[in-house]
Each structure stands twice: as structure tokens, then as C-alpha cells.
Interface confidence: low
């Protein structure tokens, strides 16, 4: 969690002199309670926006917007604390709006916005706006919270952000899977324009239950420049058991920009029903190198029968 690096953070608006400050997420009013405190924010809205850094990088940001209730408590409103909590890491980042002048009622409802919290793809956050000073321990709460889910890198707008492009979101491997004679499976995919190794992982399941019955991993050498955007082929020799027929193939690149955390692409080949002609179903997930798959058994097999284009072991 971090703040977008460029431009001075602004919270002033006509009729209000305001400054944005870093916050420890523990406002002084917790320690020194006040008797008179403002009411809670109204209509808290969180939206996904996109912003450029000074370097020209594009990042997803949380656009936070809320309004004030039209009651007399605005006379005691000294500012607001904005808190963003990343749910899977418990990491929290806060900023404080400090009002340098008193608020007055005017002809329209007071509205505040902040769009400087950088968020990560495929992450969930809890966004809280606390009005300051915070209430005494037994007082009514004067904050509002909302959860905010950031789309993953498959999302059209997200795909072109710097974190997604760094993880390989622009690469479309166009994976095809072909069942050959003699228990073989040929996987083809388009190489990206970088001399980087790839790993192709095959896991097979039985049709009747979600039971992993076969595993193979193949590595592919980093292609030479003249091979960029060409098709790479890997041939796997499958399990001899006819019931071990539901195949899940993943292609994992090791681009220099993401290394252990590159976006993987996968296709699933179901067991044949009538004919062997199957249409692979594309899926993609976002896993680090050290967790080859989520929710399935460990590799049991790494036989190198069959052939592979650019065949390579790290």
C-alpha cells in the first residue's frame, strides 16, 4: 500500500482551507477524547480510478468520495482520517485531512474526494473514513467503512496498468492443446518478445472425481530474438490409464519484470465424451513460482518422455 508519488495532495476547496498529512492511523482524539464530536460521513463511495505518476506509469487507485450530514456537528468537524486496509496482508495506510478553517453551512452539501491510494490488482480493501475528532470511547461511531475489490489483470482497463503489464498482461499465448496418438498431448503457444524461459505444467485428473492422477513439468529455453512471437511446441506423454483423461495445462513465463510472479495462462481439456475433439477452456491465474498450483496435490511425476521445442531444465 502506498500513495501515488506525484503532485502535492490537496483537500482545500472553496470555503475551506485544508491540508493533507501522513497519519499513523491513531488520531490524537483517541488518546485525548473530546466531549463534542461530529457525526459520521454520509454516502461513502469507493471507485476504481487510474492515475499516472510523474514517470508516466499508470496505476489503479481508489477514488474515495463522501459527503457531510447536514447537521450542526459540522461546527465541530476538524478533519477526517482516511484509512485503507489490505485484507489479505492486514497492511494499513492512513492519511489525515486537517481543516485549517471552520466549516460553515452553505447552499450545497459539503463533498470530499481523495484519489491517491495506489491499489493492487485482484486485491480486496476496506476503506474507512473517520471524522475527527473521533468520539469518546462510549460515544456513537463517527466513521463509515466500505469494502472495495480491485479487478484482476484480465479486466480491460487494468490490463494496461504498470503492475499488470509488468506481470505480463499484454502477452496472449493463444494456447492450443492437441491430443495425439499413443497417449500424447501437444501444447502450442506463442512466445513473447523477450528472451525468457517458460515452464509448461500438465496436471491430469480422473473424470469422475477431482483426483490428481498425473503430473509433468517441462521447461523451455529462453527463445532467441528471431523466435519471438513464434509458436513453441511441447509434447507430453500422458498417463496410460484411460480414466486419467481430464487435463489442465499451464504456461508460466519468467519475464524479467515479474520473475516469480508472472501471470500464468491455462487451458483445460475435458475427458472425451463422444469424440476426441475438445475445445480448451481458457483460464488464467496469478500465482508465484513457488506455488505451482492452488488447491491440488503436489507433483508426483517429472518424466521427460516425448519432445519439446526449446526443451530445457533450469
Amino acid at each position: 500500500l502506498r500513495l501515488l508519488d506525484h503532485r502535492a495532495l490537496v483537500c482545500s476547496q472553496p470555503g475551506l482551507n485544508c491540508t493533507v498529512k501522513n497519519s499513523t492511523c491513531l488520531d490524537d482524539s483517541w488518546i485525548h477524547p473530546r466531549n463534542l464530536t461530529p457525526s459520521s460521513p454520509k454516502d461513502l463511495q469507493i471507485q476504481l480510478h487510474f492515475a499516472h505518476t510523474q514517470q508516466g506509469d499508470l496505476f489503479p487507485v481508489a477514488h474515495i468520495e463522501w459527503t457531510l450530514q447536514t447537521d450542526a456537528s459540522i461546527l465541530y468537524l476538524e478533519g477526517a482520517e482516511l484509512s485503507v486496509l489490505q485484507l489479505n496482508t492486514n497492511e494499513r495506510l492512513c492519511v489525515r485531512f486537517e481543516f485549517l478553517s471552520k466549516l460553515r453551512h452553505h447552499h450545497r452539501r459539503w463533498r470530499f474526494t481523495f484519489s491517491h491510494f495506489v491499489v493492487d490488482p485482484d486485491q480486496e480493501y476496506e476503506v474507512t473514513v473517520h471524522h475527527l475528532p473521533k468520539p469518546i470511547p462510549d460515544g456513537d461511531p463517527n466513521h463509515q467503512s466500505k469494502n472495495f475489490l480491485v479487478p484482476d489483470c484480465e479486466h480491460a482497463r487494468m490490463k494496461v496498468t504498470t503492475p499488470c503489464m509488468s506481470s505480463g498482461s499484454l502477452w496472449d499465448p493463444n494456447i492450443t492443446v492437441e491430443t495425439l496418438e499413443a497417449h500424447q498431448l501437444r501444447v502450442s503457444f506463442t512466445l513473447w518478445n523477450e528472451s525468457t524461459p517458460y515452464q509448461v505444467l500438465l496436471e491430469s485428473f480422473s473424470d469422475s472425481e477431482n483426483h490428481s492422477c498425473f503430473d509433468v513439468v517441462k521447461q523451455i529455453f529462453a527463445p532467441r530474438q528471431e523466435e519471438f512471437h513464434q509458436r513453441a511446441n511441447v509434447t507430453f506423454t500422458l498417463s496410460k490409464f484411460h480414466w486419467c483423461c481430464h487435463h489442465h495445462v499451464q504456461v508460466q513465463p519468467f519475464f524479467s519484470s515479474c520473475l516469480n510472479d508472472c501471470l500464468r495462462h491455462a487451458v483445460t481439456v475435458p475427458c472425451p465424451v463422444i469424440s476426441n475433439t475438445t475445445v480448451p477452456k481458457p483460464v488464467a491465474d496469478y500465482i508465484p513460482l513457488w506455488e505451482p498450483r492452488s488447491g491440488s496435490s503436489d507433483y508426483k511425476d517429472d518424466d521427460d518422455k516425448g519432445s519439446s521445442h526449446h526443451h530445457h531444465h533450469h
Partner: antibody, heavy 118, light 107 residues
Framework: EVQLVESGGGLVQPGGSLRLSCAAS????????MNWVRQAPGKGLEWVSF????????YYADSVKGRFTISRDNAKNSLYLQMNSLRDEDTAVYYC???????????WGQGTTVTVSS | DIQMTQSPSSLSASVGDRVTITCRAS??????LAWYQQKPGKFPELLIY???TLQSGVPSRFSGSGSGTDFTLTISSLQPEDVATYYC?????????FGPGTKVDIK
Amino acid sequence: EVQLVESGGGLVQPGGSLRLSCAASGFTFSSYSMNWVRQAPGKGLEWVSFISARSSTIYYADSVKGRFTISRDNAKNSLYLQMNSLRDEDTAVYYCARPKVGGGMDVWGQGTTVTVSS
Amino acid sequence: DIQMTQSPSSLSASVGDRVTITCRASQGISNYLAWYQQKPGKFPELLIYAASTLQSGVPSRFSGSGSGTDFTLTISSLQPEDVATYYCQKYNRAPFTFGPGTKVDIK
């Protein structure tokens, strides 16, 4: 020069807390997953926790789950381990380590010593 | 969780001897195995990754082999500077468990 430097170790009473830091330099920290590994006096290596490059995936050893929190600040090139409810058996040298593409951990810090004792 | 075991737990050999350390996983882990050397008072150093690939800068007398559940680290000609504890580690999925270690010294 690729370097990891741990800090924050010290003596703490059982039930206490400590926050370890690991400062990375000489490589693009934001591209790498990171790990904490510990070694109790006279014992072997024990993997403690893993965090992926953008904090999207986090794992803990069963022995520390619910007590330790791994985090990172890519803008500061820093890795952290917040250790709460510390026990005697958490006494160890704590290393941060960078995974290598293809496997293993190829860059290690020099370690920071945590002693839990009353 | 997958358990990692190493044998022997310690060994003594003469300079120039061929030394073999084995590491066994309780379930198959393909070639997702690394070997480390740790000298007394020092941090561990990566020797081998992907079961058999020598880490850059590591002397060629070290080699690794195996796949699935059984792995071997071999020192073809033991040198005085090889006195250390050697650990295997699996990294196919969390937890990324280490073996208990094998202490190697010179007779």
C-alpha cells in the same frame, strides 16, 4: 551489489512483540517474492513466511500462523515481519532471503537475533 | 504437509573422498528441490536448485540428482572448505520445508 540487511532483533519477554525489518538493495526488490527463514540456536533451518512481489500471496509456517505477519513496502525496498505473542521457541536468528527464478533462495541477509526470555 | 528427511545426520570423511547425502520427500515434489551449504556462524548459501542445476559460482565438485521423492547431493572430492551443514529444501508449494540437515566434517 545485491544485499539484504536485517534489523530489529533483540531481547523480548514471552508474550511480547517485535518487528523485524529487511532492507534490500542492488536489485529490483518489487519484482521478487521474499521469505523469512529462522534458525534456533544449534538447530536447523526453518522456513517461516513467504510474500509474493505485490503482496498478493502470503504463506506462513504452522508454527507462527496467527502470531506473525509478513509485509513489504516496495517503495522503501523493505520487507517486514511483525511478531506478536512471542514464545521461548521463537528464539532464533531470523534471515530474510530472496527466491531465485527456477528455485531455491540465492540471496540471504546476515541475520538478526531474536531472544525470547523472561 | 510434505516431510523432508535427510541421511545421514552427520558424516566424517577424508579429504578427496566422494561424499553422498540423500534427501527424501514424503510425497513427490518433481524437481522442486534446492540444496544449501551453511558454514558455522554464517548464513546459508544456495548450491543446487531444480534438483540438479549448479548455482553460479559453486565449484563443479558439487552435483545434485533425483526427481520425485529421492534426491542426492554429491561432493566428488571433499575439500577442507566443504566442512559445513548441508540442507535440502522443497519449494513446490507452501510450506517450503527444509530437511533437518547433514553435518559434514573431515576425519
